[in-house]
Amino acid sequence: ATKLTEEKYELKEGQTLDVKCDYTLEKFASSQKAWQIIRDGEMPKTLACTERPSKNSHPVQVGRIILEDYHDHGLLRVRMVNLQVEDSGLYQCVIYQPPKEPHMLFDRIRLVVTKGFSGTPGSNENSTQNVYKIPPTTTKALCPLYTSPRTVTQAPPKSTADVSTPDSEINLTNVTDIIRVPVFN
């Protein structure tokens, strides 16, 4: 098994996590990409996705998560704005490539969010002050909320414009076979 490394980010509440996940340009430029949290026991959980196929440098905002896929640079930029202590955890970028298993982009991100100082919460350059100037996305092809044998009625989260489930179930296997190794801090 491949040994996974972690990149640690220590930030204060109200700041922005800004990471770039590199990928092989020719292979994955238009593939759908996802930002996942790794729950206890190696259980990846998708939090946000790019469109399918992924659009070049088109920001997708889902709640406080903003994804931008730069095809010409072969990188997925992930921002989590207005960080909260509860956002602390282990994250990863993956590329969906059905029917094969998702491809994990190294390194994993170990995010540690601590309470800010009593001063203005977003007063440094990593703060969230400017991030909401991004025009809200109206994308409809984000990752599905839920799958069931029949159709699904759903509403988008209040903080995003429109999120809807693709017509068919995405037939994916989990990345755990690739990533079942100890985590190193």
């Epitope: 259980m43 709640g63 998560i65 989590m80 839920y146 995003t160």
Partner: antibody, heavy 121, light 112 residues
């Protein structure tokens, strides 16, 4: 048809172990996590743990740590939950339920029919 | 662990009348992606639980539109606009914001 079919009722003595199976059909087995939830007679629902059928990794509720083991057999699309050192308080209906790891929701959209486990001397 | 508190414990209802169940969590269930990780299940007598509402306010497949979920953060409500006889059973809220998943104690809905 998407379903989870569980093994039949069991009667066990205190101190013994029980192994309940949950066979999945109608979907890609490795694409969904399987959780185990139990319900003592006349009581509420209690989450026990989760297994990722793709790699076999698990996470258990603290309360069951050391007594519960969840495994899977991908060749038969079956998940197993074994509970050891049984006591009378373990008398309950045990349910398996599926959750998708690749969808945003964590909801349990499909549940097994439940397996009654009675612990009695 | 996140503690889920449901009220009332028992809810006698009249068919055709509205009903409301409250669920409160000890920590916020709002995730960074803007979704509240709170689901509602109904367990009819002698049956397995069934999903009604997921992510706080999304109705699951096949669930009648008389059921609706609302709320954010730590306070959530399940509403039945007009109760029908088939709605009797125990309603549970469940948080899936962090492991271990935890359920509310349940609300038993019965016809008056």
């Amino acid at each position: 048809q998407v379903q989870l079919v569980q093994s039949g009722a069991e009667v066990k003595k205190p101190g013994a172990s029980v192994k309940v199976s949950c066979k999945a059909s109608g979907y890609t087995f490795t694409s969904y996590y399987i959780h185990w939830v139990r319900q003592a007679p006349g009581q509420g629902l209690e989450w026990m743990g989760i297994i990722n059928p793709s790699g076999g990794s698990t996470s258990y509720a603290q309360k069951f740590q050391g007594r519960v083991t969840m495994t899977r057999d991908t060749s038969t699309s079956t998940v197993y939950m074994e509970l050891s050192s049984l006591r009378s308080e373990d008398t309950a209906v045990y349910y398996c339920a599926r959750e998708s790891g690749y969808h945003v929701s964590t909801a349990f959209d499909i549940w097994g029919q439940g397996t009654m486990v009675t612990v009695s001397s | 662990d996140i503690v889920m508190t449901q009220s009332p414990l028992s809810l006698p209802v009249t068919p055709g009348e509205p009903a409301s169940i409250s669920c409160r969590s000890s920590q916020s269930l709002l995730h960074s992606n803007g979704y509240n990780y709170l689901d509602w299940y109904l367990q009819k007598p002698g049956q397995s639980p069934q999903l009604l509402i997921y992510l706080g306010s999304n109705r699951a497949s096949g669930v009648p539109d008389r059921f609706s979920g609302s709320g954010s953060g730590t306070d959530f409500t399940l509403k039945i606009s007009r109760v029908e006889a088939e709605d009797v059973g125990v309603y549970y809220c469940m948080q899936a914001r962090q492991l271990p998943w935890t359920f509310g104690g349940g609300t038993k809905v019965e016809i008056k």
